[in-house]
């Protein structure tokens, strides 16, 4: 194998889901001493940054001031130390939201259920889309895909207290262009005390934020960015 440097981490701040016309920063964390970072968009060269002084910087930021559907897609970054290049980062799926319309999210049999009950979410949008996404707010930002002409079903099956939390849905016009988010639906699952203590709710964000859950330690940051990297990478699989 030709020697290559370890792949950098890539993530978006405040989030990989960006409302149209809002700003987003794509961050790429490589190694101290890297003399050049490149941001690639869908395989094309998007931007180059040559940090100064390189030995004191291990992260660069690429700023997008005005998100739109042309900027939505798959990003990766790569860096160089001397003549040696890194492997490209994992792919970051940058999604533009608040496109066109707002779906309606409902839950059956209702938002308050008992552990073990079967629960189904319904996401409805009357405009031209056939793919829907259900997200549970929280650090791991679970995403489920569903299909239907105007409505998609998301059966959760028999729920446990781990399913508690706030859900929203989106209509998707293509992989990287989503509708406005639905109004949130908070699912409350009651169960016995043992179950509750064993399955705490994911930490959720304030209702008005979709920001990443950033930790303050460097290792924490790396782990968390890797987690978001992974979430974004698997969003569209």
């Amino acid at each position: 194998q030709q020697q290559t440097l370890p792949k950098p981490f890539i993530w978006a701040e405040p989030h990989f889901m960006v409302p149209k016309e809002k700003q987003v920063t794509i961050c790429c964390q490589g190694n101290y001493g890297a003399v050049e970072y490149q941001l690639h968009f869908e395989g094309s060269l998007f931007a180059v940054d040559r940090p100064k002084p390189p030995e004191r910087i291990n992260k660069v930021q690429f700023y997008i001031p005005d998100m739109n559907s042309r900027m939505a897609g798959q990003y990766s970054c790569i860096y160089r130390v001397g003549e040696l290049w890194s492997e490209p980062s994992n792919l970051l799926d940058l999604v533009v939201t608040e496109m066109y319309d707002t779906p309606t999210l409902s839950v059956h049999p209702g938002p308050e259920v008992i552990s073990g009950e079967k629960v189904t979410f319904y996401c409805r949008l009357d405009t031209a889309t056939s793919m829907f996404l259900l997200l549970k707010e929280g650090r791991s930002s679970h995403v489920q895909r569903g299909y239907g002409k105007v409505q998609a079903e998301f059966p959760l099956g028999p729920v446990t207290t781990a399913h508690r939390g706030t859900y929203r849905c989106f209509g998707s016009y293509n992989n990287h262009a989503w509708s406005f988010p639905s109004e949130p639906v908070k699912l409350l699952v009651t169960g016995d005390i043992e179950n509750t203590s064993l399955a705490p709710e994911d930490p959720t964000f304030p209702a008005d934020t979709w920001g990443t859950y950033l930790l303050t330690t460097e290792t924490g940051l790396q782990k968390d960015h890797a987690l978001w990297d992974h979430t974004a990478q698997n969003l569209l699989r």
């Epitope: 792949k7 869908e42 094309s44 180059v48 798959q74 290049w85």
Partner: antibody, heavy 116, light 106 residues
Framework: QVQLQQSGDDLVKPGASVKLSCKAS????????INWIKQRPGQGLEWIGR????????YYNEIFKGKAILTVDSYSNTAYIQLRSVSSEDSAVYFC?????????WGQGITLTVSS | QIVLSQSPAILSASPGEKVTMACRAS?????IHWYQQRPGSSPKPWIY???SLASGVPARFSGSGSGTSYSLTISRVEAEDAATYYC?????????FGGGTKLEMK
Amino acid sequence: QVQLQQSGDDLVKPGASVKLSCKASGYTFTSYWINWIKQRPGQGLEWIGRVVPGSGRTYYNEIFKGKAILTVDSYSNTAYIQLRSVSSEDSAVYFCARVGGYWDYWGQGITLTVSS
Amino acid sequence: QIVLSQSPAILSASPGEKVTMACRASSSVNYIHWYQQRPGSSPKPWIYATSSLASGVPARFSGSGSGTSYSLTISRVEAEDAATYYCQQWSSNPYTFGGGTKLEMK
């Protein structure tokens, strides 16, 4: 070490289809985009399209849509270009190139000759 | 699409001379890349992202420019530099190449 090994030169009849290959070795195949480039005898370089082996996602130069199909086989670390219904206009050398910090590794090229 | 025009088409130089070749884009591009190609060989990456030298390229080569106007300069030409040089952009679809400048030795 990194290598892109392209299949041998080919002679095909007009109207036929042909599939040319580019076998990668020495790196993580799925992480890097592969571009295909055409060069007619004595002429310049023309970009055909690109593919990312991780997902098979492709982009084409509009003028090659319907003519070229780019595919990958991640098990054998091989990228392919299929040219449909070839004519003398398709007689050229075809290169594959990997995208790192630049188009850092190129195949040696395949000379395709279209002749009856 | 972005059309890249290279000039001159043919450049004759004597060893030790300084030479410059130009690449003009039909609309603004952020980066231009250069390749060297000798007959019967694959293009070799030469200069990338306007001014960075690819691995193994001698320091007598340099690249510069911005917007629609870019250039490749050889400070002191050597016989081994005889080849065709292509400029390219790969930031905007479809990616495009210039028609090439052939550098010949006098």
